[in-house]
């Protein structure tokens, strides 16, 4: 249960800017790039680079654009119909199971293992045992430390790849 991180919205932004385009809702909904007015009569456009909506909606205000964290690069900017796309910087990755921050990729595999997968923005390097071909799981000491581990003893648990 603690893994479920949620975010409540901040106070709605004021939407009275005269330059915002308006159109009529369709079946009570507004198209991507718009939100609905409080009286439900108008669709008001989102502000480019500030907020967005990606689907037909009855939102009273558009959603705030994501700002990329330090350690991330912006792949594509926020538009009125699409949120910012951020990606971990080269040499770092973000796992689905621990998505809060970009983590540094390992620089090499432990003794007795070979690298079969490179560091990507969404995955660490992948190591397998030379002989058995089983995949390495869990934390791995730095390459320098693995040299000192006992022969035949893996530095951390291994599991069958599947």
């Amino acid at each position: 249960e603690s893994a479920l991180i949620t975010q409540q919205d901040l106070a709605p932004q004021q939407r009275a800017a005269p330059q915002q385009k308006r159109s009529s809702p369709s079946e009570g909904l507004c198209p991507p790039g718009h939100h609905i007015s409080e009286d439900g009569r108008d669709c008001i456009s989102c502000k480019y680079g500030q907020d967005y909506s990606t689907h037909w909606n009855d939102l009273l205000f558009c959603l705030r654009c994501t700002r990329c964290d330090s350690g991330e690069v912006e792949l594509s900017p926020c538009t009125t119909t699409r949120n910012t796309v951020c990606q971990c910087e080269e040499g770092t990755f973000r796992e689905e199971d621990s998505p809060e921050m970009c983590r540094k990729c390992r620089t090499g595999c432990p003794r007795g293992m070979v690298k079969v997968g490179d560091c990507t923005p969404w995955s660490d390097i992948e190591c397998v045992h030379k002989e058995s071909g089983t995949k390495h799981s869990g934390e791995v000491p730095a390459v320098e430390e693995t040299v000192t581990s006992s022969p035949g003893t893996p530095a951390s648990p291994c599991s069958l790849s599947g």
Epitope: L4, T6, Q8, N57, L60, F61, L63, R64
Partner: nanobody, 125 residues
Framework: EVQLLESGGGLVQPGGSLRLSCAAS????????VGWFRQAPGKEREFVSA????????YYADSVKGRFTISRDNSKNTLYLQMNSLRAEDTAVYYC???????????????????WGQGTLVTVS
Amino acid sequence: EVQLLESGGGLVQPGGSLRLSCAASVSTFGTSPVGWFRQAPGKEREFVSAIRWDGVGAYYADSVKGRFTISRDNSKNTLYLQMNSLRAEDTAVYYCALPRRGDSELPSTVKEYGYWGQGTLVTVS
């Protein structure tokens, strides 16, 4: 542990209606956006609708716009999907889902969701 249990599916004639429910056993349900997805036989799971944490405002897929309505009751930790004017192409297993992280106010892609129910089958025939 996060548990989501869908109900309300069944067999319905074209043009008919169904109301799906999703009961959540997680204390943070009332502070999280939540969504409905569906998966037809042989097809990928697709977004149907998602609703804000406070129930004020929702997203709808083009294919269900004007026919489906999402709602929630945070006091009961329950999500609903009212489906009207059902069509044969709405036949699918319907899943409710909670996002895995809180960086999006209203997630609408499968990868943004990490907690899934077992699904309830809706057959329109």
